[in-house]
Interface confidence: low
């Protein structure tokens, strides 16, 4: 094995609970470890987990490159978090899930150069900065070199939301001075998204997983997915989805290496579902298809997608009002 | 110390598919990327793809997609590469090798593979 | 994709000479991401230099690196005779991650 950039002692050194250091204006030694946290030089690994910590720790050695900072009490990330002096210039993979982050601020990730990994999961996000991510407001960005953003389950509990649209405050963040556009893994999963805004998919031309899975998506009707050529999985597992149509199908089918996943969705299995159970029938891109079933109408319930005929999609002819019963 | 262990050379015919396999340690395993690389005798080196062990995350050169199956196995801290439909010009040396932004800090010793009919 | 052009394919350098390597990028790169590795026969690459400048622990003092932008350089300020080995460029900034043909150094 080659040698790496730090010296390699191998084991974790965990630093003593009394050994809290004060924020000093010098820099960190390289084999210091912050109290509460464990550390391995070898393996770059800082791990600061389950400790009740209220902020990120001051004293991160500079040759931290995996971070982990969950199941901790942090409410607020500011701006410039990270930011240190030598800048933590190594830092690859951050991971935050698990705290009690309410807010991330404008430029909390700046300062780090080769973050490629970002996990905010688990955290009930009431306030994300529409630059949280981009790090300034100007209308282009410089790029962020993030490649996965793992977003799942950041919607906080319905009487702490803002009298705004969740799906906007998360948009706005990804869109934010064209800064993600390397993009390659965004899981949105377990989020309430009633909808996806149209412009987001466009903006995010380097996706290669999107997890919009346990969400409450009741349709895509207005969701382009054309731009996204490198797509390689779709998680619509668990949604509300009622029939994709035609237009989203082609899309689909179009993307040269797609798989689709559509498990647990109530479909409804009326005239409006011609189309798809076609194109079911005929596309490779739908993983495990077979487990399709109906929701509605009742007549239909668990009835297999790929086993219905045009005979069986009917709609109920619309009666005039006069006979109409309430 | 980190220390990643490949398989032994591989002796494969023409058409037939092979999985070789790095085994790693001295560190935890789902924390780091472990990429492959491709080096034919006396020529430069030539990026497979990567895996994320963490969240499974597996990204390929376009050059080796459909043919390089990349697959980890947290239990065993072990990653696999399996290539198929093999032609003479994938006998090579395959190394794999952990790091990512920064350089690939430490490196398997490499596994031979020959395409002989 | 970023395709890296090193030069010279082969040199020949004395001991105690000073040695230049260089790698020319087809578009820029970040220089956080530009490496380079040292190889000798039958053995795996080593990483010699991370992020155009900073040498990997072990690597002696003799050894540099610099550059930006498309243009990157290796220099060795006094050649010994362990110097004596293969070395590639690498770029980790754009996918597919690519590396150059190689400067192969030869003791004259």
């Known amino acids: 094995s080659s040698s790496s950039p730090t010296s390699s002692a191998s084991s974790f050194s965990s630093s003593a609970p009394f050994l809290a250091s004060a924020v000093s204006a010098q820099p960190p030694l390289p084999d210091q470890c912050p109290a509460l946290c464990e550390c391995s030089e070898a393996a770059r690994t800082v791990k600061c987990v389950n400790r009740n910590l209220l902020e990120v720790p001051a004293d991160l050695p500079p040759y931290v490159r995996n971070l982990f900072l969950t199941g901790n009490q942090m409410t607020v990330l500011p701006a410039g978090a990270f930011a240190r002096q030598p800048p933590l210039a190594d830092l690859e993979a951050l991971n935050l899930s698990g705290n009690h982050l309410k807010e991330v601020c404008a430029g909390a990730f700046e300062h780090l150069p080769g973050l490629r990994r970002l996990d905010l999961s688990h955290n009930p996000l009431t306030n994300l900065s529409a630059f949280a991510f981009a790090g300034s407001n100007a209308s282009v960005s410089a790029p962020s070199p993030l490649v996965e953003l793992i977003l799942n389950h950041i919607v906080p509990p319905e009487d702490e939301r803002q009298n705004r649209s969740f799906e906007g405050m998360v948009v706005a963040a990804l869109l934010a001075g064209r800064a993600l556009q390397g993009l390659r893994r965004l899981e949105l999963a377990s989020n309430h998204f009633l909808y996806l805004p149209r412009d987001v998919l466009a903006q995010l031309p380097s996706l290669r997983h999107l997890d919009l899975s346990n969400n409450s998506l009741v349709s895509l009707t207005y969701v382009s997915f054309r731009n996204l050529t490198h797509l390689e999985s779709l998680h619509l597992e668990d949604n509300a989805l009622k029939v994709l149509h035609n237009g989203t199908l082609a899309e689909l089918q179009g993307l040269p290496h797609i798989r689709v996943f559509l498990d647990n969705n109530p479909w409804v299995c009326d005239c409006h579902m011609a189309d798809m159970v076609t194109w079911l029938k005929e596309t490779e891109v739908v993983q495990g298809k077979d487990r399709l079933t109906c929701a509605y109408p009742e007549k239909m319930r668990n009835r297999v997608l790929l086993e219905l005929n045009s005979a069986d999609l009917d709609c109920d002819p619309i009666l005039p009002p006069s006979l109409q019963t309430s | 110390q980190v220390q990643l262990q490949q398989s032994r050379p591989e002796l494969v015919k023409p058409g037939a598919s092979v999985k070789m396999s790095c085994k790693a340690s001295g560190y935890t395993f789902t924390d780091y990327v472990i990429s492959w690389v491709k080096q034919r005798t006396g020529q430069g080196l030539e990026w497979i793809g990567e895996i994320y062990p963490g969240s499974n995350s597996i990204y390929y050169n376009e050059k080796f997609k459909g043919r390089a199956t990349l697959t980890a196995d947290k239990s065993s801290s072990t990653a696999y590469m399996q290539l198929s439909s093999l032609t003479s010009e994938d006998s090579a040396v395959y190394f794999c090798?952990?790091?990512?932004?920064?350089?690939?800090?430490?490196w398997g010793q490499g596994t031979t593979l020959t395409v002989s009919s | 994709q970023i395709v890296l052009t090193q030069s010279p394919a082969i040199m020949s350098a004395s001991l105690g000479e000073r040695v230049t390597l260089t790698c020319t990028a087809s578009s820029s790169v970040n220089s956080n991401y530009l490496h380079w590795y040292q190889q000798k026969p039958g053995s795996s690459p080593k990483l010699w230099i991370y992020?155009?400048?900073n040498l990997a622990s072990g690597v002696p003092a003799r050894f540099s690196g610099s550059g930006s932008g498309t243009s990157y350089s290796l220099t060795i300020s006094s050649m010994e005779a362990e110097d004596a080995a293969t070395y590639y460029c690498h770029q980790y900034h754009r996918s597919p991650l690519t590396f150059g043909a190689g400067t192969k150094l030869e003791l004259k």
């Open positions: 992020s155009t400048s």
């Open positions: 090798a952990m790091g990512g932004n920064y350089g690939f800090d430490y």
